[in-house]
């Protein structure tokens, strides 16, 4: 018996088609993805093949003006229109708090939304009961398939789930649910979730009875053969893991931003064992037409967005590199721009002894969510900035000891190379890393821009000195594992909305050309 699994993950509000790098579509003939194009391909496969599931592995929320304006209602509406069969909760589904998940999505979705490792407590338990499930048994043709969900246990550090949701260890939580499915004589089980490729592989290895793992969160691109676009495969599609009980378990993920539709064909035997698995992500390029009815619906919903913010704020004459491939690995000019804007927004010349009260900025690379292409006449709009900074955060002022900053920079590279979001972009700081050294001892030079000076210059960080730093509220609250900031900050003053800070700076500068200039080495 053959099952076709179609899957998406980390779509991040890319309801409309995008450019190849998943930023705003500029030249429609070269654009990719979007729900209208996705629907065309999904329907084509549904017509051609008998047993098809369409699954989403989380993080539909957050990423463009669509989410800024519609706050999740757009996700429910268009996922319903595409007839998704199931979705796992991702960390970003909690970005507007639990209420921002319940009202627009959980109550409106016509498909099951899953997570086995999120447990509600207190008053929330009854309010959210039945709105998301640990698993769902779906009829597919003459068979049944169990889908069990999971969500990154790091979600409290990455989003705003509040205090009444407990995020358990994925493997510990999944096993009893899979066992329950087995007792219900469900012998074909898909783990669908949002914890990253490493955890996906662990689930495949450790959770007895899971036949297939469909993942997300790490934006992992897998491909067998010659890849069709710019993404470099992290491995073959599907990635095969040998489970502890000797089975070959296929693990898949489909990059991100709706650029690809994951396509996996699984052959099950009479006992529910995976006999074979093959497929590849399908690049949703312009060779696939956009479905006219979905496109018309998108255009209808688009009107409210057009009214929201399409006016030009300023111009860039350089490419603003906000790609994860850059900003999570090295100094990127988008990071420099944002940090410069953050400092500029906090210029307060209140003391003759100080050129400014604050000179330093840190910004988690994972918070930079999109590049901006200068080839659109250099135009920068609020909408462009909303794709770069989609989280609706604030840029805050904190006071930290030098020793805390040193810990933060060690944390920045403690697991360097895994494309994790804690890699810091900076302003008013020069940092030198030696990645050949062991984690926790990789910062070899950390110089900071003086404030108590008439001519700003860089001096070595002093461990016991107290410094003012501008940073995202996300970091001030210990996000991305920066617990030392939350635990050790001496003062915290909330600041202005992140997009507004950058848009004001661009409007003030009129033309910008940020460079990569050796802040991070």
């Amino acid at each position: 018996w053959e099952l076709t699994i179609l899957h998406t993950n980390d779509v991040h509000s890319r309801l409309e088609q995008t450019s190849e790098d998943s930023s705003k579509c500029v030249n429609a003939s070269r654009c990719m993805g979007g729900v209208a194009r996705l629907f065309t391909k999904v329907q084509q496969i549904r017509r051609a093949e008998p047993n098809v599931l369409l699954l989403d592995a989380g993080d539909q929320y957050q990423g463009t003006i669509w989410f800024t304006v519609y706050k999740g209602a757009e996700v429910a509406h268009f996922m319903n229109a595409l007839r998704y069969d199931a979705m796992a909760l991702g960390n970003h589904e909690f970005d507007n708090g639990v209420e921002g998940l319940i009202e627009p999505l959980l109550k409106e979705a016509k498909f099951p939304i899953l997570s086995a490792n999120i447990k509600a407590k207190g008053p929330l338990a009854s309010q959210i009961s039945g709105l998301y499930l640990p698993y769902k048994v779906l009829p597919v043709g003459d068979e049944v398939v169990g889908i069990v969900g999971y969500t990154s246990k790091e979600t409290p550090f990455l989003s705003n789930p509040g205090t009444n949701l407990v995020f358990e260890d994925e493997i510990t939580a999944l096993q009893p649910e899979v066992d329950k499915l087995k007792t219900l004589n469900v012998n074909k089980i898909i783990a669908l979730g949002h914890s990253g490729f490493e955890m996906d592989k662990l689930i495949a290895q450790k959770v007895r009875g899971v036949d297939v793992v469909v993942g997300g969160h790490s934006n992992t691109f897998l491909y067998t053969g010659n890849p069709p676009s710019k993404e470099v495969p992290a491995g073959k599609y599907p990635f095969i893991v040998t489970s502890d009980d000797g089975r070959k378990v296929p693990v898949v993920q489909a990059y991100a931003f709706g650029k690809y539709l994951g396509y996996l064909k699984i052959e099950f035997d009479e006992r529910g064992n995976v006999i074979s698995s093959h497929g590849n992500p399908i690049l949703l390029n312009s060779s696939i037409p956009e479905d006219p009815s979905i496109k018309a619906d998108i255009n209808k919903w688009r009107i409210k967005l057009d009214n929201y913010s399409t006016q030009e704020l300023g111009k860039t004459i350089v490419y603003l590199d906000g790609s994860s491939q850059s900003c999570r690995f090295r100094e990127c000019n988008m990071g420099n721009l944002i940090c410069d804007a953050m400092i500029n927004n906090n210029l307060r010349h209140t003391d003759e002894m100080f050129w400014n009260h604050v000179s330093m900025c840190i910004l988690n690379g994972g918070g930079i969510r999109s590049p901006i292409d200068e080839r659109n006449n250099g135009t920068i709009t609020w909408e462009n900035l909303a794709a770069v900074l989609p989280f609706g955060g604030t840029f805050d002022l904190v006071q930290l000891k030098g020793s805390t900053l040193k810990k933060a920079f060690e944390h920045s590279v403690h697991r360097y190379g895994q494309s994790t979001g804690e890699f810091l972009q900076v302003g008013g700081i020069h940092v030198v890393y030696d990645l050949s050294r062991k984690p926790g001892d990789r910062v070899v030079k950390l110089d900071v821009l003086c404030t108590k000076c008439r001519v700003p210059s860089y001096d070595p960080l002093k461990m016991d000195e107290v410094y003012k730093v501008i940073l995202p509220n996300f970091l001030a609250n210990g996000g991305d594992g920066f617990q030392m900031i939350k635990d050790e900050l001496l003062r915290h003053d909330s600041g202005d909305q992140d997009i507004n800070v950058v848009s004001t700076y661009i409007s003030k500068m009129k033309v910008i050309y940020p460079a990569v200039e050796g802040r991070i080495k």
Epitope: W1, G141, D142, K248, D269, E270, R271, N273, V274, I275
Partner: antibody, heavy 113, light 106 residues
């Protein structure tokens, strides 16, 4: 639990027709095929044929003229019919799942007058 | 038809021995190979499917490997209950079996 069980006569006379039934439980004949295999005493396993989930059948070329496999999906049963039986057809007859994950216990059919 | 050549046809081994059985297909069968165990009573049980995946309840001392036309079943440490006849079965086309390997006590 996924199981298969063969049933039918233990003794068949030469030239007669053998009819064996394979009763399936734990999975659907709408989704999976059934294979038939035999093993003469002390000899090797020999594939006879298969009926697919869609209802079509394939046969070993050596038996195509005298073998028919059919099914009744509603009863979860597959029937093997072999005509013109001969003493050399004495064997244990097995039905198995399409992928060989499950086998019947086998039924010994002796062809003798 | 695809022919399967299995060797050896029989072997004598002691408890604790490592045993290897091979099957060669007459053409590429793309990992669509099972290993079956038949005990003296006649009951047939699948041990390994898709070349290398272990069936539920099968001890980890059994392992399968191979690709293309060459496939191997290994018993890492032979146990008393492992004395039986083993067959390879290809399902890339119409089923064909190897000639069997009878594993006997030395």
């Amino acid at each position: 639990e996924v199981t298969l069980k063969e049933s039918g006569p233990v003794l068949v006379k030469p030239t007669e027709t053998l009819t064996l039934t394979c009763t399936v439980s734990g999975f659907s004949l709408k989704s999976y095929g059934i294979q038939w295999v035999r093993q003469p005493p002390g000899k090797l396993l020999e594939w006879l044929g298969v009926i697919w989930s869609g209802g079509s059948a394939d046969y070993n070329a050596a038996f195509i003229s005298r073998l028919t496999i059919s099914k009744d999906t509603s009863k979860s049963q597959v029937v093997l019919t072999m005509t013109n039986m001969d003493p050399v057809d004495t064997a244990t007859y097995y039905c198995a799942g399409q992928y060989g994950s499950v086998w019947g216990q086998g039924t010994l059919v002796t062809v003798s007058s | 038809d695809i022919q399967m050549t299995q060797s050896p046809s029989s072997l004598s081994a002691s408890v604790g021995d490592r045993v290897t059985i091979t099957c060669r297909a007459s053409q590429d069968i793309g990992d669509r190979l099972n290993w079956l165990q038949q005990k003296p009573g006649g009951a047939i049980k699948r041990l390994i499917y898709a070349t290398s995946s272990l069936d539920s309840g099968v001890p980890k001392r059994f392992s399968g490997s191979g690709s293309g036309t060459e496939y191997t079943l290994t018993i890492s440490s032979l146990q008393p209950e492992d004395f039986a006849t083993y067959y390879c079965l290809q399902y890339a086309g119409s089923w064909t079996f190897g000639g069997g390997t009878k594993v006997e006590i030395k």
